[in-house]
């Protein structure tokens, strides 16, 4: 059911989806479970010290296609996977950090180009 004035997107789920959440639990979550009209996700990224951090949770339908496409962010290694096939499906998502690859020589020392893997699972 759609609220008045909402668009009827063909990709909209007919019902609420429950997802596991970790480091990304909204205020209405209970026992590390959140609810969404969109996708469950699991993401791995490096923190400021270069340590891999895994985050999981809910993505609203609006804008989630873009987020699940894992658009590269300059100077940040990360990978995200999304799913909708069942409740808590993101328990079974295990994205990995893309490898560091040498970028072309410029002047001076070697820099690293951050490559990004695109995961968009349904």
């Amino acid at each position: 059911k759609k609220e008045d004035g909402e668009s009827t997107a063909p990709t909209a789920r007919p019902k609420v989806l429950r997802c596991k959440c970790h480091h990304h639990c909204p205020e209405d979550s209970v026992n590390n479970i959140c609810s969404t009209d969109g996708y469950c996700f699991t993401m791995i990224e490096e923190d400021d010290s270069g340590t891999p951090v895994v985050t999981s949770g809910c993505l609203g339908l609006e804008g989630s296609d873009f987020q699940c496409r894992d658009t590269p962010i300059p100077h940040q290694r990360r990978s995200i996977e999304c799913c909708t096939e069942r409740n808590e499906c993101n328990k079974d998502l295990h994205p990995t950090l893309p490898p560091l690859k040498d970028r072309d020589f410029v002047d001076g020392p070697i820099h690293h180009k951050h490559h990004h893997h695109h995961h968009h699972h349904h």
Epitope: E3, K15, V16, R18, D28, I33, G60, R86, N87, E88
Partner: antibody, heavy 117, light 113 residues
Framework: QVQLQQPGAELVMPGASVKLSCKAS????????MHWVKQRPGQGLEWIGD????????NYNHKFKGKATLTVDKSSSTAYMQLSSLTSEDSAVYYC??????????WGQGTTLTVSS | DIVMTQSPSSLAMSVGQKVTMSCKSS????????????LAWYQQKPGQSPKLLVY???TRESGVPDRFIGSGSGTDFTLTISSVQAEDLADYFC?????????FGGGTKLEIK
């Protein structure tokens, strides 16, 4: 049209278990959550729990954990709630209700459960 | 658990009068991600099962007469019947679906004078 059919009444002995049914028709069972709600005479409504028929994922009100067990039979489009170790406190009307977004847009007529010897 | 408190517990009105009933939640039902209030209103006529009137605090369910108006945000909500009819004799319940377990208010019994 959407229909949730429930038996009108059940009489059960204290200490026994009962399995209440809710047969869904007029819509695709797996497109909605199925909830169970308790109402004691002259009192308000109490949410027991819900089940997603597509993957049988369940949520329970902590007050009913160990008391209620929710299941679904997709082949017959029927949801079930088993209540165990029955006492007089379990005497009530039990409704099934469906939801897409956690508000209940269709309700069964309710089953009146009487626990008595 | 989120506690839902309804007032008054009962009221008696004459046909054609405006009816207002209140529902308060122990914490905000406004979801910041979409700015929606996760509150519904139900009508339960004597001997019948509840019927959905309003969801997301103010969206009327299809087929519900437009004299039923839901309003409010955060923790304070109101159901208004702009011109009460004899067939509106019923109990009215609010329900939050913001956080599990979903909880209901104690109800407001509407009697017709």
């Amino acid at each position: 049209q959407v229909q949730l059919q429930q038996p009108g009444a059940e009489l059960v002995m204290p200490g026994a278990s009962v399995k209440l049914s809710c047969k869904a028709s007029g819509y695709t069972l797996t497109n909605y959550w199925m909830h169970w709600v308790k109402q004691r005479p002259g009192q308000g409504l109490e949410w027991i729990g819900d089940i997603d028929p597509s993957d049988t994922y369940t949520n329970y009100n902590h007050k009913f954990k160990g008391k209620a067990t929710l299941t679904v039979d997709k082949s017959s489009s029927t949801a079930y709630m088993q209540l165990s170790s029955l006492t007089s406190e379990d005497s009530a009307v039990y409704y099934c209700a469906r939801s897409g977004w956690d508000y209940f847009d269709s309700w069964g007529q309710g089953t009146t459960l009487t626990v008595s010897s | 658990d989120i506690v839902m408190t309804q007032s008054p517990s009962s009221l008696a009105m004459s046909v054609g009068q405006k009816v207002t009933m209140s529902c308060k939640s122990s914490q905000s039902l406004l979801k910041s991600s979409n700015q929606k209030n996760y509150l519904a209103w139900y009508q339960q006529k004597p001997g019948q099962s509840p019927k959905l009137l309003v969801y997301f605090a103010s969206t009327r369910e299809s087929g519900v007469p437009d004299r039923f108006i839901g309003s409010g945000s955060g923790t304070d909500f109101t159901l208004t019947i702009s011109s009460v009819q004899a067939e509106d004799l019923a109990d009215y319940f609010c329900q939050q679906y913001y956080r599990i377990p979903w909880t209901f208010g104690g109800g407001t019994k509407l009697e017709i004078k």
